[in-house]
Amino acid sequence: MKVLQEPTCVSDYMSISTCEWKMNGPTNCSTELRLLYQLVFLLSEAHTCIPENNGGAGCVCHLLMDDVVSADNYTLDLWAGQQLLWKGSFKPSEHVKPRAPGNLTVHTNVSDTLLLTWSNPYPPDNYLYNHLTYAVNIWSENDPADFRIYNVTYLEPSLRIAASTLKSGISYRARVRAWAQCYNTTWSEWSPSTKWHNSYREPFEQH
């Protein structure tokens, strides 16, 4: 039994880091493998992660962490029974994938303005709480070409757009994702999408 593709990990910079790797053949990850991880810190304990299958030869493990600070570094040991298959380390702050924003809501009752709001996925005491920026994706269910991205570079989790920038009388969907420049993170997954019917009064045309 050998590791074909070494574990790579990403952290949500709150409580979970996810590590994925590939074995050299079909493997029952949960019965055959264990990923041991420990914070490099005298006052820390060793933890064991039981991996799950992720395709035939792929494994994934969700490492639970109490919290994360930028200097944190973890040792990782992948075991198959008594055999050490791989040894490595992982610094969460260098591999951050933020949590996806939630509770995306479209408020359509604000005088021909669409107000989109969502929730910051982090609690106020987390470092990323004040460092997230967002991308909002709006698209038409009827017209695949009607697809747009709005970059929200301010901290408030909301976006206002004129309803008239979208077509009237048709349904739209929106979703939002986050990233943090300070840790050069990857983008989060998209939030679940929300749907609304776009209708607004056309301005009266004078001839």
């Epitope: 810190f41 005298l42 006052l43 304990e45 060793a46 919290d67 600070v69 930028s70 200097a71 944190d72 470092y127």
Partner: antibody, heavy 125, light 111 residues
Framework: QVQLQQPGTELLKPGASVSLSCKAS????????MHWVKQRPGQGLEWIGL????????KFSENFKTRATLTIDKSSSTAYMKLSSLTSEDSAVYYC??????????????????WGTGTTVTVSS | DIVLTQSPPSLAVSLGQRATISCKAS??????????MNWYQQKLGQPPKVLIY???NLESGIPARFSGSGSGTDFTLNIHPVEEEDVATYYC?????????FGGGTKLEIK
């Protein structure tokens, strides 16, 4: 208030073993690491090892790995250190000490925030 | 192991004056931009008591006349103005790796 109570003295013969106790009160015993520190007469401080009362995880200084055993009795909130094969070099004051972790955005710091009263161990034939 | 060397081994300071104690580490005790150095005071017949943690942070309840500074391998504890009750031995201690070690101590007396 937070207190770590240790017996005052232990008089032992070379080659014997001793079990030192440290009774904690005033805080959640199982939430904090407990350390043991040695201080020889008129000398500095030497870290022996630590134990987590909730998991029994232990770590030791190389100098004490083979002779020191750390245990916990959760029911009485008491930590114990057993030291075996005693010699005159083991004559010292032994302190238990609770540590506190301070987490900043950058790093995790720890220090000994509460010390026991100390047990004076004398090894003499 | 990281060796901490304190100097001077003893010093006598007049009341109201400044006491400066140095602690030099055999290798850096910094990591991630922070310094892992603590200072303790031990009075005769008593256990040690923390004064400063993370090089420069004053422990709660400790008078502001105690201050810590430094980074890397060089650290300093300052006491100003020195008072009668400060007669004690002072120890530095690093918390950067296993094992944590202490300096040899500096005995402060009043002139």
């Amino acid at each position: 208030q937070v207190q770590l109570q240790q017996p005052g003295t232990e008089l032992l013969k070379p080659g014997a073993s001793v079990s030192l106790s440290c009774k904690a009160s005033g805080y959640t015993f199982t939430s904090y690491w407990m350390h043991w520190v040695k201080q020889r007469p008129g000398q500095g401080l030497e870290w022996i090892g630590l134990i987590h009362p909730n998991s029994d995880t232990t770590k030791f200084s190389e100098n004490f790995k083979t002779r020191a055993t750390l245990t916990i009795d959760k029911s009485s909130s008491t930590a114990y250190m057993k030291l075996s094969s005693l010699t005159s070099e083991d004559s010292a004051v032994y302190y238990c000490a609770k540590s506190k972790i301070i987490t900043t955005i950058v790093a995790r710091h720890w220090y000994f925030d509460v010390w026991g009263t100390g047990t004076t161990v004398t090894v003499s034939s | 192991d990281i060796v901490l060397t304190q100097s001077p081994p003893s010093l006598a300071v007049s009341l109201g004056q400044r006491a400066t104690i140095s602690c030099k580490a055999s290798q850096s005790v910094d990591y991630g931009g922070d310094s892992y150095m603590n200072w303790y005071q031990q009075k005769l017949g008593q256990p040690p008591k923390v004064l400063i943690y993370a090089a420069s942070n004053l422990e709660s309840g400790i008078p502001a006349r105690f201050s810590g500074s430094g980074s890397g391998t060089d650290f300093t504890l300052n006491i100003h103005p020195v008072e009668e009750e400060d007669v004690a031995t002072y120890y530095c201690q690093h918390s950067n790796e296993n094992p944590p070690t202490f300096g040899g101590g500096t005995k402060l007396e009043i002139k």
